[in-house]
């Protein structure tokens, strides 16, 4: 069982309390009330990609 | 085989208070989410309460907020619903369920029920 | 909360019969959708997951459909074992799941 604030969540995924495991944040555009989305949007999704260098 | 046994439930005065089992069988129990869904005589089903696989989150409806309490012993393979200030509308078969291992999305495994009957 | 309205609420079927359960949400809940059926007496057991997926062991006979708002159960040849009532359960919403009020299929 992961201790919150430990071990993060890979890029583009995020904690779920509700669920115990990480997340795919590619689900919260559809299902924005998950409680994990609130981390997604914190962090920019996997296949983010910066614009400059 | 897939089982959820219920029990605890019974006859209760109002304002009195009951504890259901839910013992969980024929599946390892602690990656699940669990919940409890309620069925008054007659009617429909309503959700009671959600809780995480470790524990660590749950969730109630706002009928019973304040009321009731949702635990697990993952030890035990046991689900609780500790239930307070029970009221005559609380009268209903109470449910077990098990979750799927994706976010609320679906509840394969049903108990057989236990009933509430809260009255004087 | 959302709310989940089935209809009919009732309706009578002969075996072999084509029957249609519709259930409509208050708002949009993408494919989060899922049915149930439950015989008296009986738990719930669940036949439709995702709007669309069969459960594993429910026959092929049963099938759902729709997104957004409407939604629909279809039973392609009713069955003696299928006279029950069917339940839509929106999981959208969380962690504020919502049943339909049930459609209670008779045998005519």
């Known amino acids: 069982e992961r201790v919150p604030g430990t071990t993060p969540c890979s890029r583009g995924s995020s904690w779920s309390a509700d669920l115990d495991k990480c997340m795919d944040c590619a689900s919260c555009p559809a299902r924005p009330h998950s409680d994990f989305c609130l981390g997604c949007a914190a962090a920019p999704p996997a296949s983010f990609r910066l614009l400059w260098p | 085989e897939v089982q959820l046994l219920e029990s605890g439930g019974g006859l209760v005065q109002p304002g009195g208070s009951l504890r259901l089992s839910c013992a969980a069988s024929?599946?390892?129990?602690?990656?699940?989410?669990m919940m409890w869904v309620r069925q008054a005589p007659g009617k429909g089903l309503e959700w009671v309460s959600y809780?995480?696989?470790?524990?660590?989150?749950?969730h109630y409806a706002d009928s019973v907020k304040g009321r009731f309490t949702i635990s697990r012993d993952n030890s035990k393979n046991t689900l609780y619903l500790q239930m307070n200030s029970l009221r005559a509308e609380d009268t209903a078969v109470y449910y077990c369920?098990?979750?799927?291992?994706?976010?609320?999305?679906?509840?394969?495994?049903w108990g057989q029920g236990t009933l509430v009957t809260v009255s004087s | 909360d959302i709310q989940m309205t089935q209809s009919p609420s009732s309706l009578s079927a002969s075996v072999g019969d084509r029957v249609t359960i519709t259930c409509r949400a208050s708002q949009s809940i993408s494919s989060y959708l899922n049915w149930y059926q439950q015989k008296p007496g009986k738990a719930p057991k669940l036949l439709i997951y995702a709007a669309s997926s069969l459960q594993s062991g429910v026959p092929s006979r049963f099938s759902g459909s729709g997104s957004g708002t409407d939604f629909t159960l279809t039973i392609s040849s009713l069955q003696p074992e299928d006279f029950a009532t069917y339940y839509c359960?929106?999981?959208?919403?969380?962690?504020?799941?919502?049943f339909g009020q049930g459609t209670k299929v008779e045998i005519k």
């Open positions: 369920a098990r979750g799927g291992d994706t976010y609320f999305d679906y509840f394969d495994y």
């Open positions: 809780i995480s696989p470790s524990g660590g989150s749950t």
């Open positions: 024929g599946f390892t129990f602690s990656p699940y989410p």
């Open positions: 359960q929106q999981s959208y919403s969380t962690p504020g799941i919502t």
